[in-house]
Interface confidence: low
């Protein structure tokens, strides 16, 4: 995972695979790390525009595909502080990016098994 | 029909440890993550802790350095070990399943009560 430089405030984007580059179907985790207390509400933008999700503090895109390329960051809004943005971090989806273990996957069982 | 069967709660003294555990009791299929929420009463619930497909983990603040969260990849199931529990810890317990492509799986909810 690679630490996006926080500012003063203590909010950090987390991206896996490093560097943001990954295989097409392979899978983005990006993790908003804030430190603040009580945890606040976290939202996420891609290319300056809010994704329509629930708020969470973990983004995750599986099965990448070029259409989930961009500039990624999250805001953290707490009531007593306000809103607060990340860094923001760039995913790129690329043949030679990291697709990482299938995930996922069905065994003979027919239960779905994590990577 | 899946469902997620939680146990392990209970009450217990503020320092003391608890193992939730969250199995699916069917097929499930197209898991990328596992995680945990709570939610005290009258508040909203809040998410906990999280472990993706690839082993990644990640925790709410307030947990960090107690909980931790793990998983059995041939049972579909997941589990929070929670040490030097606070007060401040008590709340219905919820583990969640996402698939891709799919709505999440939830479970019933476990209570824990910490007492001073």
């Known amino acids: 995972r690679v630490r996006e430089p926080g500012p003063p405030e203590g909010i950090q984007l987390l991206v896996e695979p490093e560097g943001g580059i990954v295989a097409p179907g392979g899978t983005v985790t990006l993790t908003c790390a804030i430190s603040a207390q009580p945890p606040p509400q976290v939202h996420w933008i891609k290319d300056g525009a809010p994704l329509p999700l629930a708020p969470s503090p973990v983004l995750l895109l599986p099965e990448v595909g070029h259409e989930d390329e961009g500039t990624y960051s999250c805001v953290a809004t707490h009531p007593s502080h306000g809103p607060q943005e990340s860094p923001p971090v760039s995913i790129r989806v690329t043949e030679t990016g990291d697709e990482g273990p299938a995930e996922g996957s069905v065994g003979e069982s027919g239960l779905g098994t994590l990577a | 029909q899946v469902q997620l069967v939680q146990s392990g709660g209970g009450l217990v003294q503020a320092g003391g440890s608890l193992r939730l555990s969250c199995a699916a009791s069917g097929s499930v299929s197209s898991i990328y993550a596992m995680g945990w929420y709570r939610q005290a009463p009258g508040k909203q619930r809040e998410w906990v802790t999280t472990?993706?497909?690839?082993?990644?983990?990640d925790y709410a603040a307030s947990v960090k350095g107690r909980f931790t969260i793990s998983r059995d990849t041939a049972k579909n199931a997941v589990y929070l070990q929670m040490n030097n529990l606070k007060p401040e810890d008590t709340a219905r317990y919820y583990c969640?399943?996402?698939?891709?492509?799919?709505?999440?799986?939830w479970g019933q909810g476990t209570q824990v009560t910490v007492s001073s």
């Open positions: 969640k399943i996402d698939r891709r492509g799919y709505a999440p799986y």
């Open positions: 472990i993706t497909g690839r082993g990644i983990t």
